[in-house]
Structure formats: C-alpha cells, structure tokens
C-alpha cells in the first residue's frame, strides 16, 4: 500500500523592511523540528510594497494602511490559513525613519503607530514595528549572509553548496548600501576594535565572533546625491548647476526647499538667491568621482586608521558580500561578474557616464527616468565609497562579491533579524538528535 504523505510540519515568519525608498515584505519558511539547525530557513516570497518608503507618508499617515494592503494580502495567500495565528510579523524601519526621527520624534512615532495599527488588523502574530539601529542593520546583514553561506555550520564539507563558498569557516564581511545609509561589517584579523561603538561580540553555534560594524547615516545613495548637490550648488555662480554625475544633455529642475528638506544637507545649507536651480548633465566620471570624494572628510582620524569622517575602520579582512543597492546598481550596469576587475569597472563607468542622455533613454526605455538618470552617480558613488571610503584596492576588489540572493533568499538584514527575534540562532552548537542529519533512514 502507498504511504500517505504526512502534513508538512513547517513554520513561517514575516519581516517587513521599511527602507528609505521602499518597503519590502519577506516571507520565510523552515521545518519546525529543525529550528536550531543552520541554513534551514529560506525565503519563499518577496513582495515589494508599491510606492515610496513609509517616511514619505508623514503628512498622510491615515493612508499607510492602503499602502501595506497588497503585500499583507499576499502573505495571507502564501501562508496556509492554519498557520496564520502563529506566524510572527516584524517590521524594521531603517535610515529613512532614523532621519525622520532626527527631524521630529513625534512625527516618526505617529508613522510607526499607524503602521502598528494597520499590521495588527491581519490574522498574524504581530510582534511590533520599530526603527532598528544602524548597528543592528549591519549586524543582521552580516548574520544573514553568513547563515545563508553556511559559515556557522560546524560540519566540514568536501563539496560546495553555495556560490562564493571558499570551503572554510571564515566568515564573509557584509557591505550594505541603502538609500539613506550604508553599513560595513566584518571580523577583523586579530585586530583590537579601537572604538567600542563599532564592536559587537556574538556567540553563535558554539563559536565566538568579534565583529566590527559601522553604519554611515546620510551616505546611502539617495542621501549622498542630495549632499553632493547641496555642496555643489554652494559654489555655483547662478541657478545652473553643470553636473558631471549626470549624462550630457540631461536637464532637471530642483527646488531648493527639497534640497534642504533632509537633515543630511544641513551642513551645506546656505541662503541662495534663487528658489530653484537646473541640473545640466555633462557626464564626466573623473569629475564626478572628485566631487563625491569631497563628501568624505579624511583629514581627521583619532584612531590608527579611519574610513572617513573620523570613523574607525580596521584593515579589511577576507571576502565581502556587497548587497542591496550595491548589487542592484552594479547589476543594472552589468558589472557584477567576478571576472570584472576594478580597472574595468572604472573604464565602463567612464563610458556609461559619457553617453548622451537621449541615447541612454532610448537604450533603457523601460526604466523610469528618475532612476535611469541616477545610475551614473550611483555607480561612481559605489566606486568612490568602496575605494576611497573603505580602502578597497584594485587587488582587494576581487574579494568583493556583488550578491542579490544566496540560495534563493535575498541578502539583507531581514533574515538575520528574524533569526535573532525567533531565537533560531543558538549560542551553543545544538546536539544532533537521532536521524536529524542522517543520509539514510
């Protein structure tokens, strides 16, 4: 007689990543009886919420519920009804909301209150919405990629199950680029972490990790662009800003009020004799790169070495996974291949930025002009940040792996956040129960 298949004993979890430019909902799934095993949790769905980040709803908080509806409905469809009530839902907001909180704690709280009320209306086990710290964002991104790469597993394997696996237990560093902040997290080699704010200690699966992390607020790609514009308009002789970070022939009118809306441009704020200015692209990579470097203050360092703005950074060590906007931008520019050297990337960026705007629009007709216009800046910014900001070199460039997904799960902080909040990463190596790892039954 045929054996009847037993019902799948699985669990689900939902994490919403409320970023500065958009919100994404991730659904994770794992076998209930293997909760403490490494690498068993995987992403089954990503739903990108249609619209901007939640901080943009500050003047219309009552509409946040509509904004979230579609993806929450998707979660209701994907997760079996019998599991709804025991499925935890977490929302973590990142730098967009950190910036809003800097402007007004009251407004940030109001946005989060409405988010909490909206998410509480669904049949899931809502666990709260909060603004996570930059340190958490870096740490959870590091946990995510190393969990997915199998770096916490104590079992040595003679075969590779994931790309980038170097078959050793040395962890990968994590490079995360968002719209409003960027994070760098890695285990330095026998180096004291000179700044306590940047030091994390973990005990995971029976092993101790001393991790360096820093989140640079205002140095995500969108806020970095606002900073650059605010810096450059200071020295413009009139309301025309000839900008090397935009394609030749590109034109865009910017309101000065929009430029100074973000706390990130406060240091460049001045009274200008005009309310608007026009960006006119000239498409020159080298000049764009030089302009971006002026955002990084490297003249002051109270430690043995720094990244920029007086922030301690130990010598880089090992391989790094670069994800989120690092990946999306480089993927668009077709520069994610392991075989592309840093010199080649620079060469390609020079060519790309020099292409006329009309030509670019024709070549990428399906891409929204706002996004399309900013790839020259974003690509140049990534190179500037990695090379001058974090001190990667032409040689160490090959240790950067631009990663979108690992084993079908997105690289990012959300998985690490959920693993932590559901206590699925034990401090000690779990004892194998009979049959749980056996090949034959």
């Amino acid at each position: 007689t045929q054996n009847k298949a037993l019902p799948e004993n699985v669990k689900y979890g939902i994490v919403l990543d409320a970023g500065s430019s958009h919100t994404s909902l991730y659904i994770y799934k794992w076998p209930a009886e293997k909760e403490n095993d490494t690498g068993v949790v995987h992403q089954v769905e990503e739903c990108r919420v249609k619209g901007p980040g939640i901080s943009k709803f500050v003047q219309k908080v009552n509409e946040i519920g509509i904004y979230l509806t579609d993806c929450m409905e998707r979660a209701r469809e994907v997760i079996p009804r019998s599991q709804h009530q025991e499925t935890p839902v977490y929302l973590g907001a990142t730098a967009g909301m950190r910036l809003l909180r800097m402007e007004s704690e009251e407004l940030a709280d109001r946005v989060l209150d409405v988010v909490e009320r909206s998410l509480s209306n669904y049949p899931f086990d809502f666990q709260g919405a909060r603004i996570i710290t930059g340190q958490e964002e870096g740490a959870y991104g590091w946990i995510t990629i190393n969990y997915l790469l199998g770096k916490f597993s104590q079992k040595t394997r003679w075969f590779s199950i994931v790309p980038y696996e170097t078959n050793n237990q040395e962890t990968f560093g994590a490079l995360d680029l968002g719209g409003a902040s960027t994070q760098v997290t890695f285990v330095p080699q026998n180096q004291t972490i000179e700044s306590p704010d940047n030091a994390l200690q973990f005990r995971l699966y029976g092993k101790d990790y001393n991790v360096y992390t820093h989140s640079f607020l205002c140095y995500g790609k969108d806020q970095a662009l606002w900073q650059k514009l605010a810096k450059d308009i200071q020295v413009a002789s009139n309301e025309i800003l000839r900008d090397p970070c935009f394609h030749p022939g590109y034109k865009k009118v910017v309101n000065v009020s929009d430029l100074y809306k973000t706390p990130c441009t406060k240091r460049f704020e001045m009274t200008l004799p005009f309310q608007q200015f026009e960006i006119q692209g000239i498409g020159n990579y080298q000049q764009c790169h030089q302009s971006i470097l002026e955002l990084f203050n490297t003249s002051y360092c109270p430690y043995s070495q720094c990244a920029f703005n007086g922030i301690f950074l130990p010598p880089l060590q090992g391989d790094f996974g670069a994800f989120s906007a690092f990946y999306f931008v480089m993927k668009f520019l077709n520069l994610t291949s392991e075989k592309v050297s840093q010199e080649k990337v620079t060469e390609m960026m020079k060519k790309f930025c020099a292409q006329p705007w009309e030509e670019i629009k024709t070549s990428y007709a399906g891409v929204k002009e706002k996004y399309l216009s900013e790839y020259c800046f974003s690509g140049t910014y990534i190179l500037s940040l990695l090379l001058q900001g974090y001190h990667f070199t032409a040689d160490s460039w090959e240790h950067i792996h631009f990663i979108g997904k690992i084993q079908g799960s997105d690289a990012g902080w959300t998985l690490g956040y959920m693993l932590n909040l559901t206590n699925m990463i034990p401090a000690e190596q779990p004892l194998s129960t009979p049959l749980s790892h056996s090949t034959y039954v």
């Epitope: 769905e45 990503e46 739903c47 990108r48 249609k50 619209g51 901007p52 943009k56 709803f57 003047q59 219309k60 009552n62 509409e63 519920g65 509509i66 904004y67 509806t69 579609d70 409905e73 998707r74 209701r76 469809e77 209306n121 399906g366 891409v367 929204k368 706002k370 996004y371």
Partner: antibody, heavy 121, light 106 residues
C-alpha cells in the same frame, strides 16, 4: 506622465483565442501591479486579475481562472491578457489599469482606453 | 469574496440638489474607493481611501464611512456630474466593484 495604451478592437469566433496588449510608459514597469478588468456592454465592472511585474506573480479572480492568462514582456513594457476558448459571454470591453503611490506618496489610478472584444459566429 | 451592494440603482436629481449614494459591503473593509464612468470612456478614480478626492475632483464631492457602510455625497449637483458611480474595495482579493449607481438627468 503614466500612459497605458491598449491594442485595438477584436472580432472573434467562438472557440478562438485572443491576446489583448497593454503598453505602459511614464513609469518603471516593475513598480506597480497591472490589473485587468472586464465590462460587458451596459454592465458592471469585474476584476479579472493582476500581475506583479517585479516578481512575475499573478492573481486571478476565481471566476476567471482557467481560460484567462495574464503575462508580461518586460523588454517592451507590455502586459497581455490571453483568453482562449472564446464564448459569446466574453464579449466586453477589457481594460488594463494600475494604481498605487508615486514617489511623493500621491495616490494615482490610471486605466487604458479599453479594448472591445466581440465574440460572434 | 466581498460583495458590494449600491443603493439606489438609479437617481434622477435636479441641478443644485444634494445627492447621496450608498455602498454596503458583505464584510468589513478598511477603505472604499469610488469611480465615475461616462459612456465610452474608462472609469475614472473619483474618491480614494473612503474620503480623499482624487486629483482634479471638485470639492462638492465627499466620501465617508467605515466597516461595511460607505457613502459618496455630491453637495450640489451640476450638469457634468451625471454619470455612473461605482464603489470598489481593494482590501482583499478578489478586488470587487459595486453594481453601479446611475445618476441621470431628470
């Protein structure tokens, strides 16, 4: 601005297949779900289903599941609604549409001009 | 699925008159949206999220309600307001429309 341009009117025989297109411009194709709605002559609007170009995922109204298929061709920013085994009750105007929040959190809702499908022997 | 019922089915107000259209849902919805449609044209979003006027919609229109009962009101009817009005819920799938209320010239 956002524009949705649909293919022209169709006259088909029962049992045939039709493919109606909806070409979109003025926004990033993967940013919003693309919906299809049916409106028989002089009758109510009925939601057929939608597609999320970002993930490729589709949803259908149970009533329209089976003969209706929604697809996209991302390279040309176009969504399609395929309908097979046509019947006379499929005679209707079919609309594509999308809605959501733009970058400044302004709500919008845009529709194509509609495609009249006539099924007659 | 959530079934929407509109009342009345037809209305014949005079210009200047106040008009109220009701939409009732078979189970609770978070928001209601309203569309106006004129012959030979696609529906046009009129009110979104229960009470917000879509871009370019005159202030004589308003929307209200919660749970299962929603209302569209025209404070003073004008000639260009004669059309069919549909309510729609986007709170759960499948998305559903009401059967429409025809506001016709007396």
């Amino acid at each position: 601005e956002v524009q949705l341009v649909q293919s022209g009117p169709e006259v088909k025989k029962p049992g045939a297949t039709v493919k109606i297109s909806c070409k979109v411009s003025g926004y990033s194709f993967t940013d919003y779900n693309l919906n299809w709605v049916k409106q028989p002559p002089g009758k109510n609007l009925e939601w057929i289903g939608n597609i999320d170009p970002y993930s490729g995922g589709t949803r259908y109204n149970q009533k329209f599941k089976g003969r209706f298929t929604i697809t996209i061709d991302q390279s040309i920013n176009t969504a399609y609604m395929h309908l097979r085994s046509l019947r006379s009750e499929d005679t209707a105007v079919y609309y594509c549409g999308l809605y959501g929040y733009d970058d400044d959190a302004n709500y919008f809702d845009d529709w194509g001009q509609g495609t009249m499908l006539t099924v007659s022997s | 699925e959530i079934v929407l019922t509109q009342s009345p089915a037809t209305l014949s107000p005079s210009p200047g008159e106040r008009v109220t259209i009701n939409c009732s849902a078979s189970s609770s919805v978070s928001y209601m949206h309203w569309f106006q449609q004129k012959p030979g044209t696609p529906p046009r979003l009129w009110i979104y999220a229960t009470s917000n006027l879509a871009s370019g919609i005159p202030a004589r229109f308003s929307g209200s309600g919660s749970g299962t009962e929603y209302t569209l009101t025209i404070s003073s009817m004008e000639s260009e307001d004669f059309a069919v009005y549909y309510c729609q819920q986007r709170s759960s799938y499948p998305l559903t429309f009401g059967p429409g209320t025809k506001v016709e010239i007396k």
